[in-house]
């Protein structure tokens, strides 16, 4: 799978993780620290 | 699947505001960014800021700073593109467009005319 | 704010021509640049994403290419279905559009 960095713009849209560019899904995904879970890494579960 | 159903068109008189609404279904908004973007009868396209409805944060074009104002309720899954200080330049179809995890996803436009 | 110039504004080919419309940016955008075809009383409709990622139903004879800042739309053989006018989009840093290239039938 071709992964990139997401566009300036996407700056901030993962809140705990980074934002990364599936290129071959043509998606932006955010890859969440541990403890995060949810589209925008928005929610933290124990 | 998922939609973004824009209002109905609008007149209206010139110095007046016009506030146009975008209404999501089969998404939440707080997974996405909206986008506002117009094109004037004849004209291009002209991108006009966006919101992180998330965040509640919004970035406007240079030339629409202090004129326009965009807003998004998450609990009606709704974003909201206010106009103020209209003039006949502002007559155009409005579009918001949805973007995010997958690319652009666009309204079905609202016209908005400016006439006296 | 990035600018993108587009070019040509206008032009007319003959059906079976290549077609090249070209984009450039004030800075490099990495890439992230969008290509849409728009025909009188639509709305814009997306053919390619992050330079040359054609979306799913649409014709192979569009394809994008480029890197920095400068881009280029390709339309292999041109048919009577692709009158419209095309757009550039930047979305690396905010949003900008090019100004259009109208395609017509000569």
């Known amino acids: 799978v071709s992964i990139t960095k997401c566009n300036s713009d996407m700056n901030g849209y993962c809140l705990h993780g980074q934002c990364i560019y599936l290129v071959d899904m043509s998606q932006n995904y955010c890859r969440c620290e541990v403890g995060y879970t949810g589209v925008r890494c928005e929610h933290f579960y124990l | 699947q998922d939609q973004l159903v824009q209002s109905g068109a609008e007149v209206k008189n010139p110095g007046a505001s016009v506030k146009v609404s975008c209404k999501a279904s089969g998404f939440n908004i707080k997974d996405t960014y909206i986008q506002w973007v117009r094109q004037a009868p004849g004209q291009g396209l002209e991108w006009m800021g966006r919101?992180?409805?998330?965040?509640?944060?919004?970035k406007y074009r240079e030339k629409f700073e202090g004129r326009v104002t965009i807003t998004a309720d998450t609990s009606t899954n709704t974003a909201y593109m206010e106009l103020s200080s209209l003039r006949s330049e502002d007559t155009a179809v409005y579009y918001c467009?949805?973007?995010?995890?997958?690319?652009?996803?666009w309204g079905q436009g609202t016209l908005v005319t400016v006439s006296s | 704010d990035i600018q993108m110039t587009q070019s040509p504004s206008s032009l007319s080919a003959s059906v079976g021509d290549r077609v090249t419309i070209t984009c450039k940016a004030s800075q490099d955008i990495h890439k992230y640049i969008a290509w849409y075809q728009q025909k009188p009383g639509q709305a814009p409709r997306l053919l390619i994403q992050?330079?040359?990622t054609l979306q799913p139903g649409v014709p192979s004879r569009f394809s994008g290419s480029g890197s920095g800042t400068d881009y280029t739309f390709t339309i292999s053989s041109l048919q009577p279905e692709d009158i419209a006018t095309y757009y550039c989009l930047q979305y690396d840093n905010r949003r900008t559009f090019g100004g259009g290239t109208k395609v017509e039938i000569k």
């Open positions: 467009v949805r973007s995010g995890r997958e690319f652009d996803f």
């Open positions: 992050y330079t040359s």
């Open positions: 919101i992180d409805p998330l965040r509640r944060q919004t």
